[in-house]
């Protein structure tokens, strides 16, 4: 059956060394757990993380997200899953793609993540 | 298994404030956006704002512009509502409700509602 | 704002009835649309999302369908616990908004 893939229509924002969500949904919902789920950098398709068969790839990953990430599957099956990042880091600024893949149909969408330096803060003062 | 818990009943009078609290539990409070909807006695539903408690920013229904402001603590994974300048007319359940992670998504969790009755 | 009327207001009907509630949009709101049980005291409950999508934990025989302006909420066969008031809601623009209410009471 077809779906649409949807996400969040704003950045995600998250500060460095904190952790950072990104939801992705598809509609109508529908059971996902026998799909393939994933996200990749949208510049060069790094895979950030996959799952597939019902297991986390985590071979498949990019060097740079091993280890740092999550899949919370706990809503799989309504077609509801987050990518937790944890540790972000500056390089993970930019944009994001989930994909869900049913046999060989396949849905994506496009989200943000924004990443901020807790301790940076400019005295406009000082800006001449 | 998430859960909002809010404060209790409130009476009050015309022309002062009230300030209701949903405390969140069960969910990475910060990523989901927090809506208040109001129900007067007999009415139907009617959604008064929303916020995303990660940018902290607060949308609001015109018709509450300038009287209702939301917030939320992330500290305390606690949003509140205060509407001020109260009326007989804003004698009503109030609820606050969770959409999943963003805005324009339905209201999945609810919290048990506060009884707001404005009376001189 | 997209203003939801449902029809009926009241609706009266008999445990095991086939029971049929429509929500209709001022404008097209794609698929776009929950409903939501509520009894008396508690707070509102959601059956179905995206038009069509039951939520996890509610019975098979609640059911949606529609799209852009005309929606349906459809109790194939009524049971006891589904006498309550039954609200749709558009969420296809930043001010969600409310259908009336349908009250769906024993015959």
């Known amino acids: 059956g077809q779906f649409r893939v949807i996400g969040p229509g704003y950045p995600i924002r998250a500060l460095v060394g904190d952790e950072a969500e990104l939801p992705c949904r598809i509609s109508p919902g529908k059971n996902a757990t026998g799909m393939e789920v994933g996200w990749y950098r949208s510049p060069f398709s790094r895979v950030v993380h996959l799952y597939r068969n019902g297991k986390d790839q985590d071979a498949e990953q990019a060097p740079e997200y091993r280890g740092r990430t999550e899949l919370l599957k706990e809503t799989i099956s309504e077609g509801k899953v987050t990518l937790r990042i944890q540790n972000v880091r500056f390089s993970d600024e930019g944009g994001y793609t989930c994909f869900f893949r049913d046999h060989s149909y396949q849905e994506e969408a496009a989200m943000e993540l924004k990443v901020e330096d807790p301790f940076y803060w400019v005295n406009p003062g000082v800006l001449t | 298994q998430v859960q909002l818990v809010q404060s209790g009943a409130e009476v009050k009078k015309p022309g002062s404030s009230v300030k209701v609290s949903c405390k969140a539990s069960?969910?990475?409070?910060?990523?989901?956006?927090i809506s208040w909807v109001r129900q007067a006695p007999g009415q139907g539903l009617e959604w008064m704002g929303g916020i995303i408690p990660i940018f902290g920013t607060a949308n609001y229904a015109q018709k509450f512009q300038g009287r209702v402001t939301i917030t939320a603590d992330k500290s305390t994974s606690t949003a509140y509502m205060e509407l001020s300048s109260l009326r007989s007319e804003d004698t009503a359940v109030y609820y606050c409700?969770?959409?999943?992670?963003?805005?324009?998504?339905?209201?999945?969790?609810w919290g048990q509602g506060t009884t707001v009755t404005v009376s001189s | 704002d997209i203003q939801m009327t449902q029809s009926p207001s009241t609706l009266s009907a008999s445990v095991g009835d086939r029971v049929t509630i429509t929500c209709r949009a001022s404008?097209?709101?794609?698929?776009?649309l929950a409903w939501y049980q509520q009894k008396p005291g508690k707070a509102p409950k959601l059956l179905i999302y995206?038009?069509?999508s039951l939520e996890s934990g509610v019975p098979s025989r609640f059911s949606g369908s529609g799209s852009g302006t005309e929606f349906t909420l459809t109790i194939s066969s009524l049971q006891p616990d589904d006498f309550a008031t039954y609200y749709c809601?558009?969420?296809?623009?930043?001010?969600?908004?409310f259908g009336q209410g349908t009250k769906v009471e024993i015959k």
């Open positions: 809601q558009q969420y296809h623009e930043y001010s969600p908004t």
């Open positions: 409700a969770r959409e999943w992670y963003w805005p324009d998504n339905p209201f999945d969790y």
């Open positions: 404008q097209s709101i794609s698929s776009w």
């Open positions: 995206d038009a069509s």
């Open positions: 069960g969910g990475t409070f910060s990523s989901y956006a």
